[in-house]
């Protein structure tokens, strides 16, 4: 996309990491077949992708989860792509929802989110889910990334 | 994206093709409203997209399938985006899973996969599914593509 | 992506809008955290994204809906990404289908569509669904966009 020193390619693809934390923010790692083009995008605290340059970015996340209707709350499983810009409150960019499966012990489902957004220097994006304990971390099932247009 | 002779755009979008083969690798065709930007990306043997240039690519696949819980194995329907680099074994880049529907005769569901990956010259990507006989080949339901950043 | 006056970035991301119209074409708005890079892409009549320049575009849509098997027709919920080129009939680029949920009063599900397509100057893309009354318009649930390669 962006060629030359003035316009280096900026892209990232990180892999889900199981976490003992009770937070609803998913954890990610630079492992397996990951992508981190350069230091103009970084994975911070294993939870957010932070960009150094302003611009339009295509941001995406995929979350696979395994849940059961009887064992889960009545509310659906929701994955949210969220933005934290410097000096601003967090906001939701994208959400997807899937009702829990009736399959036993649980039924797997995959969610994909993606969209084009303007990011400011220092902006961070992260992924939130209603129940992180239901997320599938087998390789390739859950990932998160972006690319600068 | 990449302008001029030095940086031609490289992109492909191919359409699913029903196959009598028993292989779990999906078959594709340059038909309908397909995209094949130039010979720097090619569809080989109707099953894999092969690139000539090293670089970062956004690769995606969409698979629609129709299955029934009683008529299928207990395992979910899984679609995998796979990579074969020259001189290396195949590996899975992305996977998505959906539990079979209880709808009769079968319930349709759609899976979308997408991510940014570094590809080497001669690398091929392909899509694998647990049961190709369940895949829907109606217009627009199942497709596969990439674009070079 | 495309730098300089000759190659401005062209991208859009619009947000779903509830509509009293009975049409199956979804309505969109430039509201919330939307993107409209410049006047080389426009949202027309709140229903279609129209481009002024020929080229390859990655076009995507996400639709979240809430439906119930008993209250819906037997046919699945289908979302279609459609193209209207000047002087041509409309055509379907991408479709995704999800069987209705058995959850009461309704079960939420999300669909993601995306692919690379060649668009002509004046071409418009829009999103069609089988039942627009089932679409979820909460923040981030349903969106539509494109980016020029």
């Amino acid at each position: 996309m962006q060629k030359g020193d003035q316009n280096p390619q900026i892209a990232a693809h990180v892999i889900s990491e199981a976490s003992s934390k009770t937070t609803s923010v998913l954890q990610w790692a630079e492992k397996g077949y990951y992508t981190m083009s350069n230091n103009l995008v970084t994975l911070e605290n294993g939870k957010q992708l932070t960009v150094k340059r302003q611009g339009l970015y295509y941001i995406y996340a995929q979350v696979t989860f395994c849940s059961n209707r009887e064992a889960s709350s009545q509310a659906p499983f929701i994955a949210s792509l969220c933005l934290k810009s410097p000096g601003r409150f967090e906001r939701i960019l994208l959400r997807a929802a899937n009702t829990h499966s009736s399959a036993k012990p649980c039924g797997q489902q995959s969610i994909h989110l993606g969209g084009v957004f303007e990011l400011q220097p220092g902006a961070s994006v992260f992924v939130n889910v209603t129940d992180p304990s239901q997320v599938s971390h087998g390789t390739g099932f859950t990932s998160f990334g972006l690319l600068k247009l | 994206m990449q302008k001029g002779d030095q940086n031609p755009q490289i992109a492909a979008h191919v359409i699913s093709e029903a196959s009598s083969k028993t292989t779990s690798v999906l078959q594709w065709a340059e038909k309908g409203y397909y995209t094949m930007s130039n010979n720097l990306v090619t569809l080989e043997n109707g099953k894999q997209l092969t690139v000539k240039r090293q670089g970062l690519y956004y690769i995606y696949a969409q698979v629609t399938f129709c299955s029934n819980r009683e008529a299928s194995s207990q395992a979910p329907f899984i679609a995998s985006l796979c990579l074969k680099s020259p001189g290396r074994f195949e590996r899975i880049l992305l996977r998505a899973a959906n539990t079979h529907s209880s709808a009769k005769p079968c319930g349709q569901q759609s899976i979308h996969l997408g991510g940014v990956f570094e590809l080497q010259p001669g690398a091929s990507v392909f899509v694998n599914v647990t049961d190709p006989s369940q895949v829907s080949h109606g217009t627009g339901f199942t497709s596969f593509g990439l674009l070079k950043l | 992506m495309q730098k300089g006056d000759q190659n401005p970035q062209i991208a859009a991301h619009v947000i779903s809008e509830a509509s009293s119209k009975t049409t199956s074409v979804l309505q969109w708005a430039e509201k919330g955290y939307y993107t409209m890079s410049n006047n080389l892409v426009t949202l027309e009549n709140g229903k279609q994204l129209t481009v002024k320049r020929q080229g390859l575009y990655y076009i995507y849509a996400q639709v979240t809906f809430c439906s119930n098997r008993e209250a819906s027709s037997q046919a699945p919920f289908i979302a279609s990404l459609c193209l209207k080129s000047p002087g041509r009939f409309e055509r379907i680029l991408l479709r995704a289908a999800n069987t209705h949920s058995s959850a009461k009063p309704c079960g939420q599900q999300s669909i993601h569509l995306g692919g690379v397509f060649e668009l002509q100057p004046g071409a418009s893309v829009f999103v069609n669904v089988t039942d627009p009354s089932q679409v979820s318009h909460g923040t981030g649930f349903t969106s539509f966009g494109l980016l020029k390669l």
């Epitope: - | 074994f89 570094e118 694998n128 | -």
Partner: antibody
């Protein structure tokens, strides 16, 4: 516990073929790379080729191309290596070795090995 | 093919002392995409199959004692046994896992002095 159990020793005449089997247990056979590595008496290790059963297409070292065939039977969790046109210098211990699974990578590193099968080629 | 060259061919070290084995590849085995070195180390005792010790140049396989460590990048790699034990007497091989054919070094025999 992952185990790779190979077939027994073989004595073969020059020009003939040998087929060695490798039965896997304790893992999801179809998603792991199975390679074949040989070791001539008192010599080092030599990779011959390998296969991931779910993909079914074998990779071969150029040196053995056309003379070796590697297959896998998912139903019995067994991999096979057939070497044809045998000559005396093919006398070696033949090992099957498992790489990481296709989703854990790298499949090109071998974490479990069979006990080895001695193939003697002699007239 | 990538040629792997180990040095020395054999090594005699006192119990409790450090043993160092070098391995040089004829071309880089570093993947630019994720900075991973596709290099592994194996231990082979007489009459046994090889055993994986280290992969990705420096990652210890589970169950391998921490006296074994790997280092290096690109074309030059080292296996270190920080404090040699009697059970470490074996032949050690490096292997490039970068591209087919996956090739091994000629081996280094480690004995007790």
């Amino acid at each position: 516990q992952v185990q790779l159990v190979q077939s027994g020793a073989e004595v073969k005449k020059p020009g003939s073929s040998v087929k060695v089997s490798c039965k896997a247990s304790g893992g999801t056979f179809s998603s792991y790379a199975i390679s074949w590595v040989r070791q001539a008496p008192g010599q080092g290790l030599e990779w011959m080729g390998g296969i991931i059963p779910i993909f079914g297409t074998a990779n071969y070292a150029q040196k053995f191309q056309g003379r070796v065939t590697i297959t896998a039977d998912e139903s019995t969790s067994t991999a096979y290596m057939e070497l044809s046109s045998l000559r005396s210098e093919d006398t070696a211990v033949y090992y099957c070795a498992r790489g990481a699974s296709v989703w854990d990578g790298p499949a090109e590193v071998f974490d479990y090995w069979g006990q080895g099968t001695l193939v003697t080629v002699s007239s | 093919d990538i040629v792997m060259t180990q040095s020395p061919d054999s090594l005699a070290v006192s119990l409790g002392e450090r043993a160092t084995i070098n391995c040089k590849s004829s071309q880089s085995v570093l993947a630019s995409s994720n900075n991973e070195n596709f290099l592994a180390w194996y231990q082979q005792k007489p009459g046994q199959p090889p055993k994986l010790l280290i992969y990705s140049a420096s990652t210890r396989e589970s169950g391998v004692p921490d006296r074994f460590s790997g280092s290096g990048s690109g074309t030059d790699f080292t296996l270190t046994i920080s404090s040699l034990q009697a059970e470490d007497v074996a032949v050690y091989y490096c292997q490039q896992a970068y591209t087919t054919p996956f090739t091994f070094g000629q081996g280094t025999k480690v004995e007790i002095k």
